[in-house]
């Protein structure tokens, strides 16, 4: 409703690429949801730029994002989670670029945690377990998990296993003996909600036993 930029500023702004991406996190803080957006070009001058979301909200027509360094976010209970919202990059009242987005299709789960590996000597296997906050959530409850592990010396040779539970058994014979392994896990929505992989959990490190010379099995 008032002037924010000189015409020259706006003309310069229109030459820039204001492509952006967003992800939502539902019930990330109690019953609060969050929406995070960022420019795809890290060199965009964000000084006078704001993000605004309109539509598919409760109580208010539009909400302004909060800016923290180079990311923009909202934390609120007021997402309707039905229908599409319009997310715009704005200079004052002028919209530079907008996207219509259903927040249920850009969900990024929280990272799994408490990853651990226990060796079962009698069964000759390793039981991998981890936890996820999504088991307690009302909305994004069903996830697909991606467990990735590698021998520590193999920089980029990750083995991936997809599963819907939070427990995985790795057979001892599939792993190298007397080796140090790194393992980590991430999650993605798998039912109704769509979106992106979570961040990886912190890595867990475990060592496989040596081969028992007499039987050819690991100790």
């Amino acid at each position: 409703e008032s002037g924010y930029a000189q015409n020259g500023d706006l003309e310069d702004a229109e030459l820039d690429d204001y492509s952006f991406s967003c992800y939502s996190q539902l019930e990330v803080n109690g019953s609060q949801h969050s929406l995070t957006c960022a420019f795809e070009d890290p060199d965009v001058n964000t000084t006078n730029l704001e993000f605004e979301i309109c539509g598919a909200l409760v109580e208010v027509k539009c909400l302004n994002f909060r800016k923290l360094q180079e990311i923009y976010f909202i934390e609120t209970k007021k997402f309707l989670l039905i229908g599409k919202s319009n997310i715009c990059v704005k200079v004052g009242e002028k919209s530079l670029t907008c996207k219509k987005i259903d927040l249920t299709t850009i969900v990024k789960p929280e990272a799994p945690f408490d990853l651990s590996v226990i060796y079962r000597e009698g069964a000759n296997d390793f039981v991998v377990t981890f936890n996820t906050s999504h088991l307690q959530k009302k909305y994004v409850k069903v996830l697909m998990h991606d467990v990735a592990y590698r021998q520590e010396k193999d920089e980029n040779k990750w083995t991936h296993v997809n599963l819907s539970s939070t427990k995985l058994t790795l057979l001892q014979r599939k792993l190298q003996p007397a080796a140090m392994y790194e393992i980590k896990v991430r999650s993605i929505p798998d039912h109704y909600f769509k979106g992106f992989w979570s961040e990886w959990s912190p890595s867990y490190y475990f060592r496989t036993p040596e081969i028992n010379n007499s039987s050819g099995e690991m100790d």
Partner: antibody
């Protein structure tokens, strides 16, 4: 504790100008949208202006648009209302008000100043 | 712009009475409604927001309800300190708007 203290009111002739200030304390001004709301003598409440937390967006009703300008100086913990081309119908107590919720733009107000009286009369 | 119609403009009631004030908006405000109490010479005080959420420190005899375009403030048992003027306010969209007020007087 949260405090909002308005100043700058007084008697002014029609067509004149006045600048109201609101000194705030007890919270981080830069986290909040802020607003001015007025009340003519014996009348109801009327919203006058809102400024976003960043100060980049300002909002006005048609009754004051083009005549009033809201601004803020977060470093000085101050909110301002510059009023130009004043009319008799602008006579009112002017309150500055802070929303309950920080950021985003939920405009319901839990903290109000004591008000400053602006009288526009020849 | 969203128009606000608050009724009644005034009412007389006795201590202990149940009092109901209504606010109607010209379009759906999706529960973006607040209620305030104001006493003479004082700034307004926030009572409720989100149409039905009681602000911290407000007595539980105050309650709010409604959705769409029709909203209600109820005082279940009027107390001496409740004689005041009450305003509704929509914050769904700009321009923000207040109802005309309801003056609650002693019968």
């Amino acid at each position: 504790q949260v405090q909002l203290v308005e100043s700058g009111g007084g008697l002014v002739k029609p067509g004149g100008s006045l600048r109201l200030s609101c000194a705030v304390s007890g919270f981080t001004l830069s986290d909040y949208y802020m607003a001015w709301i007025r009340q003519a003598p014996g009348k109801g409440l009327e919203w006058v202006s809102t400024i976003s937390a960043s100060g980049l967006r300002t909002y006005y009703p048609d009754s004051v648009k083009g005549r009033f300008t809201i601004s803020r100086d977060n470093a000085k913990n101050s909110l301002y209302l510059q009023m130009n081309s004043l009319r008799a119908e602008d006579t009112a107590v002017y309150y500055c008000a802070r929303p309950l919720s920080a950021h985003y733009g939920f405009n319901y107000f839990d903290y109000w100043g004591q008000g400053t009286l602006v009288t526009v009369s020849s | 712009d969203i128009q606000m119609t608050q009724s009644p403009s005034s009412l007389s009631a006795s201590v202990g009475d149940r009092v109901t004030i209504t606010c109607r908006t010209s379009e759906d405000i999706y529960q973006g409604l607040a209620w305030y109490q104001q006493k003479p010479g004082k700034a307004p005080k926030l009572l409720l927001y989100s149409a039905n959420t009681l602000h911290i420190g407000v007595p539980s005899r105050f309650s709010g309800s409604g959705s769409g375009t029709d909203y209600t403030l109820t005082i279940s048992s009027l107390q001496p300190e409740d004689f005041a003027t009450y305003y509704c306010q929509q914050y769904y969209d700009y321009p923000l708007a207040f109802g005309g007020g309801t003056k609650v007087e002693i019968k």
